[in-house]
């Protein structure tokens, strides 16, 4: 067989589908690898061919499109399972070709089982809701293209194992689930089960997502530097270890990059010759507000180091702040025999 542009195994496209449910899988060639779509390819005389390698096998096989009730079929650039079986798990390849052109890509498909509470190895999308922010909605994801708009499916929403029927602040509204006022107690996994008829059969689509209640933008503030502050003075003798923590609180902000850094005499620690180490730790509150601590450490501080300016800086989408640490050299305690004796006028 002639050369084929092989894009290899596209592990970015780790597709997971539930056992015994319909699945429609688009050939990734047109979405991520080629600059033209299926219609253009088809009208140019290119043919899309599907085959697969079963789990734990090396042998590529054609897909059997002659199964009872057309369990597996192809429609344009979509491979359909109506429904999936556990042993459909494997690596699937779609190949676009004619006599002069060939391009193919493989992707892994995993058919997973779920229990009665919708627990499964499925990787769940996370939807963030702002705390106490007014009505917010989540929408049952990835159900487009499974049934025509003329079909009216029934949608049932669950929180964990429990059907949402008369929750006091969560209301099912068809494909949407409305949170009247999101609270920390709303954290958890929510599942929509979409049931629709097709050719005298009933199919179910199960979609679970994780809801995480986060800090509201209404309450967001610029970074707050808790340390260093005006109440603490770092008084050291030369030769001692200098440790200065910079502790900064960041309100949760969607897609904000939180940064903390030290400057010494206006320069980044990397740009100066003194032996400084900086260790960072990060903690999060239940609403994903963030506290970052960067500890600046100089093992054996010199009198020159104790004259320098140590400034902690912080930045988020809400603004930038800075705070200098109060560092000074400890005045050595007087030695009694000489200093005190002199003080008493001894000669």
């Amino acid at each position: 067989s002639e050369r084929c542009d092989d894009w290899g195994l596209d592990t970015m496209r780790q597709i997971q589908v539930f056992e015994d449910e319909p699945a429609r899988i688009k050939c990734p060639l047109f979405e991520h690898f080629l600059k033209f779509n299926y219609s253009t390819a088809h009208s140019a005389g290119l043919t899309l061919i599907w085959y697969w390698t079963r789990q734990d096998r090396d042998l590529e096989e054609p897909i059997n499109f002659r199964l009872p009730e057309n369990r597996i079929s192809k429609e344009k650039d979509v491979l359909w399972f109506r429904p999936t079986l556990l042993n459909d798990t494997g690596n699937y390849t779609c190949m676009l070709r004619n006599t002069t052109y060939c391009s193919k890509v493989a992707f892994p498909l995993e058919v997973v089982q779920k229990d009665s509470c919708f627990n499964s190895p499925m990787k769940l999308p996370v939807h963030k809701l702002y705390i106490e922010y007014g009505i917010q909605r989540i929408t049952c994801p990835n159900v487009d293209g499974y049934f025509p708009s003329s079909v009216k499916p029934t949608i049932t929403w669950y929180m964990g194992c429990y059907k949402i029927q008369n929750f006091n602040n969560v209301i099912p509204e068809g494909m949407n689930l409305s949170f009247l006022i999101a609270l920390i107690s709303n954290n958890g996994n929510y599942t929509c089960v979409v049931t629709y008829p097709e050719n005298g059969r009933t199919f179910h689509l199960t979609r679970t997502l994780t809801v995480k209640v986060v800090g509201s933008p209404k309450n967001a503030v610029p970074p707050v530097i808790h340390s260093p502050n005006d109440h603490v003075v770092y008084e050291k003798e030369p030769g001692e270890e200098l440790l200065i923590p910079c502790t900064v609180y960041f309100s949760f902000l969607m897609d904000s990059r939180n940064e903390v850094w030290w400057t010494i005499d206006g320069k980044k620690p990397d740009d100066i010759t003194i032996d400084v180490t900086i260790n960072e730790s990060i903690s999060h509150s239940r609403t994903e507000d963030e506290t970052r601590t960067q500890i600046l450490s100089i093992k054996k501080v010199t009198s020159e180091d104790l004259k320098r300016s140590y400034v902690c800086h912080a930045r988020s989408a809400k603004g930038e702040v800075a705070k200098a640490a109060k560092v000074k050299q400890k005045v050595p305690a007087p030695r009694y025999t000489v200093e005190l004796a002199c003080g008493f006028g001894a000669t």
Epitope: D115, S116, C117, M159, C161, F167, N168, G188
Partner: antibody, heavy 119, light 107 residues
């Protein structure tokens, strides 16, 4: 650690009501459903219903529909099961049990409350 | 509602022997099944969930198997503290239902 402490034994007359309490400690009360299960003397276990305290949703087994009411008080982390129109067949030990939202088995149980219905 | 049937009603076993308890569902419950142990005057204690996963702190001599409609709880070598009543529970469908129990007694 997690504890569910139930109210003490009760003796009731037929036709009356009983209200059993279940106080939870050790763990967020709002992160769990509280279920009630009963066991008649020498008999097996029978599921009665549940409440999700954080959402106020309660559901009951068909057999007890209309006779049982399960409520919760978040401020005291206490769930209650009230059974009305008592009859002698309701003589049983009543258990509360905690169930995380994402599971469907009873991982922690109360010590049980014996309710005796006798004229 | 799904009816759970346990057999035998009573099982007489000598300490150190193996005990095999059965639980049958009136329709498939997949692997959505739990086993509990109950001693006189005590609340039940979770042993197994998901048909075969041991709960925290449960000794390895307890094992569960099966899926669909047929399930088994095996106690590989009975200890004196294992003599009790054992219940299965399905949580595949509402209402959740229990078997009537198997009493494991000393032979």
């Amino acid at each position: 650690q997690v504890q569910l402490v139930q109210s003490g034994a009760e003796v009731k007359k037929p036709g009356s009501s009983v209200k059993v309490s279940c106080k939870a400690s050790g763990g967020q009360f709002n992160d769990y459903a509280i279920h009630w299960v009963r066991q008649a003397p020498g008999q097996g276990l029978e599921w009665m219903g549940y409440i999700i305290p954080a959402y106020g949703q309660a559901e009951y087994a068909q057999k007890f529909q209309g006779r049982v009411t399960i409520t919760a008080d978040e401020s005291t982390s206490t769930a209650y099961m009230e059974l009305s129109s008592l009859r002698s067949e309701d003589t049983a030990v009543y258990y509360c049990a905690r169930v995380p939202y994402s599971t469907a088995y009873f991982d922690y149980w109360g010590q049980g409350t014996l309710v005796t219905v006798s004229s | 509602e799904i009816v759970m049937t346990q057999s035998p009603a009573t099982l007489s076993v000598s300490p150190g022997e193996r005990a095999t308890l059965s639980c049958r569902a009136s329709q498939s419950v997949s692997s959505n099944l739990a086993w509990y142990q109950q001693k006189p005057g005590q609340a039940p204690r979770l042993l197994i969930y998901g048909a075969s996963t041991r709960a925290t702190g449960i000794p390895a001599r307890f094992s569960g198997s099966g899926s669909g409609t047929e399930f088994t709880l095996t106690i590989s070598s009975l200890q004196s503290e294992d003599f009790a009543v054992y219940y299965c529970q399905q949580y595949n469908n509402w209402p959740w239902t229990f078997g009537q129990g198997t009493k494991v007694e000393i032979k």
